[in-house]
Interface confidence: low
C-alpha cells in the first residue's frame, strides 16, 4: 500500500512483497526489500525507533537505495505495519504483516503489564481499547468488571479490528474499573493484558464573571477580575484570558481550584486577572475561556476606564410621566457617571424622604399614585468625589379615570309621574377630560330580576341589552344636550344631561364616559308610573327626633287597595342607583307597614305617620297600589332622608380688634348644627341689643357697630344654641382715641 | 348587510310537531331580542313569541302558550320555534324577525289531516 | 289577546294623501310612543315604514309620516304612488301580558 503524495520526481519506494497485508506463521523469518530512488528508511510495530535488536535493516547489495528488512522468529507482537519511506518525506510503501501465534492473538503492549483507557460519560462518544489481533479474524469479546460483564461486536457501534482494537460507546463501560479483550480459538480462551478505565469529565456547567457588567474604574484604579468555572467532576480546566492592552506590566494572573462541599457533584475552579494601575488602554471588552479539552466556554464584560469622576444624566433620562391613579409610578434617575451619584429627589422645591408610599432613590417609586402626586419633581446627582452636581426636572401628570359624581350620593329611586318631562345627569371628573359621554339605555322589565343571571356588587344590573340612545324605539324620546364644563368643588367636571321628554316607559339609563385611562359609568333607574303620587309632609328632609308624614295619593276609580311598605335589607349590599326596579315584582323584600286611609273628592290617600323620625328609618318606602280594572299593580318609591342631629358648632374664630373711635367694626359668626342654632350676641356677658349703631343681620351672623364710642370696647361673645346645647366664641374689642364733647354735653 | 333564512316549514297532520329555525347573519346576533309572526293564508300579522339576546326573557301570544317554545343558539346565530300539539288555525306563513325592522321570507307551515 | 283597530280598505287616486288610522286603548297605543307601520305587498315579508310614532329608517322615501292623538296613531302616504298598493299593519308596545299587538290591516289600493 502507497502512503503520501507523489512527488513530480519521485516514485513510491516498491516493496519485494506486492501485498497490502502479509500473513506469516510464528517462528519463521519475515523478510521485506525496499528499492527506491533516494535514501529509505524502516519502521516497524512496537519500535518506531528502530532500535530493536531482533530486527536487521541491512543495504542490499545489488543496488543503490535498497534497504532490506529482517525478522528472524518473528512473534505475535510482531504483527503490525512495516513501512518503507524516503528520508525527510510523506512517501512511504506500507504493508501489515500477521503473525499468527494461536497461543499469544493478542499484541502486547510495550509496558506489558496494563493499559490505561480514559473515557467520557458522553452517550455519543465511543472508546477504542487497544487490544490488537496477530490473527485478523479473531472472534473477540469485551469483559468489563466489576460486576462482570461481556460486550460481543453486534455489528453496529460494538466492533473489533485487529488493527485497531475493541470499539465500544464509552458510556457502556464507564461503571468498570478494568477492561480486558478475550478471543476464543479452537475453544481455549486467550486474554489481552487488562486496561484500566479511568473516567475523565468534560462538562462545564457555567462560566461566570465577577463583577459581571457595569465595571467602571478612573485611571490609576485596581481592576480585579474573578472568573469562575463550575464543571462536573473529573475535569481539568485551562483558562484563557483576552483584553484590550495585552503587554500590562502590572497584570497578574492567577488560577486555582475552589473547595466544594463534599458529595458534591461539581468543582470549581478560580482565575483572577488583576491590573494594578488601569490606563485609558485597558477600557474595552475582557473575555475568559475556560477549556475542559472536550469543550470550551467563555463569558465576557466590559470595562470602561474614565479619564476622571464626572456625573451626567443619561439620554434616555424622561421629562413628563404619565400615570393613572392607583398605578406605582417609577422614575428612574438615568445617569452616566463614576463612581456613581448621590442621588436627591425634591418635589416642587421639597426634599422627598422615603416612607411607606414614596421610595426615594435611583429609582423615584410612588406606590399608590395619586392626583396630588401631580408636579414638579426634581432630581439632583452629586459626584461624590468631584462634588460636581447636575440638575434634571420630571413633569408627573397623573390621569384620572372617569368618576361620576352622582354615583357616589345615595341615588333616589323615586319613580317618574308618566308623561312628564325629565333631566337625567352625570357629573363627570376626569383628567384629562372624558373624550366622550355616551348614554345607553334598556327596559326596565328586560333587565331587572332577570332570573338567569346572576346579581353582583360589581354588576347590580344584568342587563345585556344595552342600546343606544339614538335607538329609542320602544323607549322614551330622548334628547342628549351638549356637554356642560363646571367648576364643582375646585375641580373642572363635564356635565351630560339627557332629557325625557315624555316618561312613558320605565327604563334603566347608563352613562359612560371614557378618557384615555379608562372608563366610568352609572346606572339610573328611570321607573314610570302612572299611578299613586308620593309627598312628604311637612318636610323633603325631616331632622331625627322631628314628626314626617309620607302620603300617597291616588285616583279613586282607577286604584284600590292601596298599602305602604318600606323595602328591607337586599340579599347583596346595592350601590348607588342601583337598585332593580320594579320592586312590585318582588315584596319578598318589603315590609308591610301601618297607615292611615282617608278621601277627598276624587282621590284616596294613605298616609303614614313617623313620629320622632330616627336615622333607622331612613330608607326607601313603597306605595303599591292595584288598577280595579286588570288588577296589575303599581309601585312609586320615594327614598327619605333622616338628618342626624348634630350639637351646634362655630367655625373661625372672633378676633381680638382695636379700632379708632368713629370707625365701625363688622365681625360674623357662621355657626351649624341640627337642627339649625339659633344665634345671640352678648357684651360683657350681657345680651346685647340692637340700636340704631348695632345692627344685627342673616339669623344674627353678622353684627355691625357703626360709628364705635369708647363705651361700645369691651368682650364680646357669639352664642349658638339649639335643643343639643350651645357653643361659644369671644374677643375683646379696644376702642382708642379722645371722645369728641358733643354739643348736648 | 342584515339576511334571516327561515327554514324547517311544512305539511304535518293536527296534533303533530315541527321545529322552525332561522339563520341569522351580518349582525351581533346575541345583542338582539329575536320574535316569530305569523300569516294565516289572506290574513293578517301575528305576533307569536319573543326572546331577549340572553333568552332571560320569553313572551309568548296567549293563545299559544304551552304548545310553542322559542330558543336560540347564540353560538349557531340561530333562533327555533318548536311547535307541538298543532291544529289547523296554526297553518300560516312564519316569519322570524329582529326589532319588527328586519323579516326573513317566511317558511309555509300546512297543517291538515 | 287584543288587537289593534284598522280600516280594512283605502283607496287614493296618484298624488293624492291618504291617512290610515289604527286604534288601540291607553294599554297599547295610548299609553306608549310606541307604535310602527309595516308594508307588505303580495307574497313578500313585511318592511318597517315607522317606528317610534312617526321616525322614519333610513331609506324609507319622506312621503311616509306618522302621527299619533290619544289612543290612535295614524299613518299617512302623500303624493301616493302604484307602487304604494299594499297592505299595511301597524303594531304597537302594550302592558298587557304580552308585550306586542298587531293591527287588523289595511289594503291599500292606488286607482
Known amino acids: 500500500a502507497s502512503v503520501g503524495l507523489p512527488s513530480v520526481s519521485l516514485d513510491l519506494p516498491r516493496l519485494s512483497i506486492q501485498k497490502d497485508i502479509l500473513t506469516i506463521k510464528a517462528n519463521t523469518t519475515l523478510q521485506i526489500t525496499c528499492r527506491g530512488q533516494r535514501d529509505l528508511d524502516w519502521l516497524w510495530p512496537n519500535n518506531q525507533s528502530g532500535s530493536e535488536q531482533r530486527v536487521e535493516v541491512t543495504e542490499c547489495s545489488d543496488g543503490l537505495f535498497c534497504k532490506t528488512l529482517t525478522i528472524p522468529k518473528v512473534i505475535g507482537n510482531d504483527t503490525g505495519a512495516y513501512k518503507c519511506f524516503y528520508r525527510e518525506t510523506d512517501l512511504a510503501s506500507v504493508i501489515y504483516v500477521y503473525v499468527q501465534d494461536y497461543r499469544s492473538p493478542f499484541i502486547a503492549s510495550v509496558s506489558d503489564q496494563h493499559g490505561v483507557v480514559y473515557i467520557t460519560e458522553n452517550k455519543n462518544k465511543t472508546v477504542v481499547i487497544p487490544c490488537l489481533g496477530s490473527i485478523s479474524n479473531l472472534n473477540v469479546s469485551l469483559c468489563a468488571r466489576y460486576p462482570e460483564k461481556r460486550f460481543v461486536p453486534d455489528g453496529n457501534r460494538i466492533s473489533w479490528d485487529s488493527k485497531k482494537g475493541f470499539t465500544i460507546p464509552s458510556y457502556m463501560i464507564s461503571y468498570a474499573g478494568m477492561v480486558f479483550c478475550e478471543a476464543k480459538i479452537n475453544d481455549e480462551s486467550y486474554q489481552s493484558i487488562m486496561y484500566i478505565v479511568v473516567v475523565v469529565g468534560y462538562r462545564i456547567y457555567d462560566v461566570v464573571l465577577s463583577p459581571s457588567h457595569g465595571i467602571e474604574l478612573s485611571v490609576g484604579e485596581k481592576l480585579v477580575l474573578n472568573c469562575t468555572a463550575r464543571t462536573e467532576l473529573n475535569v481539568g480546566i485551562d483558562f484563557n484570558w483576552e483584553y484590550p492592552s495585552s503587554k500590562h506590566q502590572h497584570k497578574k494572573l492567577v488560577n486555582r481550584d475552589l473547595k466544594t462541599q463534599s458529595g458534591s457533584e461539581m468543582k470549581k475552579f478560580l482565575s483572577t486577572l488583576t491590573i494594578d494601575g488601569v490606563t485609558r488602554s485597558d477600557q474595552g471588552l475582557y473575555t475568559c475561556a475556560a477549556s475542559s479539552g472536550l469543550m470550551t466556554k467563555k463569558n465576557s464584560t466590559f470595562v470602561r476606564v474614565h479619564e476622571k469622576p464626572f456625573v451626567a444624566f443619561g439620554s434616555g433620562m424622561e421629562s413628563l410621566v404619565e400615570a393613572t391613579v392607583g398605578e406605582r409610578v417609577r422614575i428612574p434617575a438615568k445617569y452616566l457617571g463614576y463612581p456613581p451619584p448621590e442621588i436627591k429627589w425634591y418635589k416642587n422645591g421639597i426634599p422627598l424622604e422615603s416612607n411607606h408610599t414614596i421610595k426615594a432613590g435611583h429609582v423615584l417609586t410612588i406606590m399608590e399614585v395619586s392626583e396630588r402626586d401631580t408636579g414638579n419633581y426634581t432630581v439632583i446627582l452629586t459626584n461624590p468625589i468631584s462634588k460636581e452636581k447636575q440638575s434634571h426636572v420630571v413633569s408627573l401628570v397623573v390621569y384620572v379615570p372617569p368618576q361620576i359624581g352622582e354615583k357616589s350620593l345615595i341615588s333616589p329611586v323615586d319613580s317618574y309621574q308618566y308623561g312628564t318631562t325629565q333631566t337625567l345627569t352625570c357629573t363627570v371628573y376626569a383628567i384629562p377630560p372624558p373624550h366622550h359621554i355616551h348614554w345607553y339605555w334598556q327596559l326596565e322589565e328586560e333587565c331587572a330580576n332577570e332570573p338567569s343571571q346572576a346579581v353582583s356588587v360589581t354588576n347590580p344590573y344584568p342587563c345585556e341589552e344595552w342600546r343606544s340612545v339614538e335607538d329609542f324605539q320602544g323607549g322614551n324620546k330622548i334628547e342628549v344636550n351638549k356637554n356642560q364644563f363646571a367648576l364643582i368643588e375646585g375641580k373642572n367636571k363635564t356635565v351630560s344631561t339627557l332629557v325625557i321628554q315624555a316618561a312613558n316607559v320605565s327604563a334603566l339609563y347608563k352613562c359612560e364616559a371614557v378618557n384615555k385611562v379608562g372608563r366610568g359609568e352609572r346606572v339610573i333607574s328611570f321607573h314610570v308610573t302612572r299611578g299613586p303620587e308620593i309627598t312628604l309632609q311637612p318636610d323633603m328632609q325631616p331632622t331625627e327626633q322631628e314628626s314626617v308624614s309620607l302620603w300617597c295619593t291616588a285616583d279613586r276609580s282607577t286604584f284600590e287597595n292601596l298599602t305602604w311598605y318600606k323595602l328591607g335589607p337586599q340579599p347583596l349590599p346595592i350601590h348607588v342607583g342601583e337598585l332593580p326596579t320594579p320592586v312590585c315584582k318582588n315584596l319578598d323584600t318589603l315590609w308591610k307597614l301601618n297607615a292611615t286611609m282617608f278621601s277627598n273628592s276624587t282621590n284616596d290617600i294613605l298616609i303614614m305617620e313617623l313620629k320622632n323620625a330616627s336615622l333607622q328609618d331612613q330608607g326607601d318606602y313603597v306605595c303599591l297600589a292595584q288598577d280595579r280594572k286588570t288588577k296589575k299593580r303599581h309601585c312609586v318609591v320615594r327614598q327619605l332622608t333622616v338628618l342626624e342631629r348634630v350639637a351646634p358648632t362655630i367655625t373661625g374664630n372672633l378676633e381680638n380688634q382695636t379700632t379708632s373711635i368713629g370707625e365701625s367694626i363688622e365681625v360674623s359668626c357662621t355657626a351649624s348644627g341640627n337642627p339649625p342654632p339659633q344665634i345671640m350676641w352678648f357684651k360683657d356677658n350681657e345680651t346685647l341689643v340692637e340700636d340704631s349703631g348695632i345692627v344685627l343681620k342673616d339669623g344674627n351672623r353678622n353684627l355691625t357697630i357703626r360709628r364705635v364710642r369708647k363705651e361700645d370696647e369691651g368682650l364680646y361673645t357669639c352664642q349658638a344654641c339649639s335643643v343639643l346645647g350651645c357653643a361659644k366664641v369671644e374677643a375683646f374689642f379696644i376702642i382708642e382715641g379722645a371722645q369728641e364733647k358733643t354739643n348736648l354735653e | 348587510e342584515v339576511q334571516l333564512v327561515e327554514s324547517g316549514g311544512g305539511l304535518v297532520k293536527p296534533g303533530g310537531s315541527l321545529r322552525l329555525s332561522c339563520a341569522a347573519s351580518g349582525f351581533t346576533f346575541s345583542s338582539y331580542s329575536m320574535n316569530w309572526v305569523r300569516q294565516a293564508p289572506g290574513k293578517g300579522l301575528e305576533w307569536v313569541s319573543s326572546?331577549?339576546?340572553?333568552?332571560?326573557?320569553?313572551y309568548y301570544a296567549d293563545s299559544l302558550k304551552g304548545r310553542f317554545t322559542i330558543s336560540r343558539d347564540n353560538a349557531k346565530n340561530s333562533l327555533y320555534l318548536q311547535m307541538n300539539s298543532l291544529r289547523a288555525e296554526d297553518t300560516a306563513v312564519y316569519y322570524c324577525a329582529r326589532d319588527f325592522g328586519n323579516w326573513g321570507q317566511g317558511t309555509l307551515v300546512t297543517v291538515s289531516s | 289577546q287584543s288587537v289593534l283597530t284598522q280600516p280594512a280598505s283605502v283607496s287614493g287616486s296618484p298624488g293624492q294623501s291618504i291617512t290610515i288610522s289604527c286604534t288601540g286603548t291607553s294599554s297599547d297605543v295610548g299609553g306608549y310612543n310606541y307604535v310602527s307601520w309595516y308594508q307588505q305587498h303580495p307574497g313578500k315579508a313585511p318592511k318597517l315604514m315607522i317606528y317610534?310614532?312617526?321616525n322614519r329608517p333610513s331609506g324609507v322615501s319622506n312621503r311616509f309620516s306618522g302621527s299619533k292623538s290619544g289612543n290612535t296613531a295614524s299613518l299617512t302616504i302623500s303624493g301616493l304612488q302604484a307602487e304604494d298598493e299594499a297592505d299595511y299593519y301597524c303594531s304597537s308596545y302594550t302592558s298587557s301580558s304580552t308585550p306586542y299587538v298587531f293591527g287588523t290591516g289595511t289594503k291599500v289600493t292606488v286607482l
Open positions: 317610534d310614532v312617526s
Open positions: 326572546i331577549s339576546s340572553g333568552s332571560s326573557y320569553i
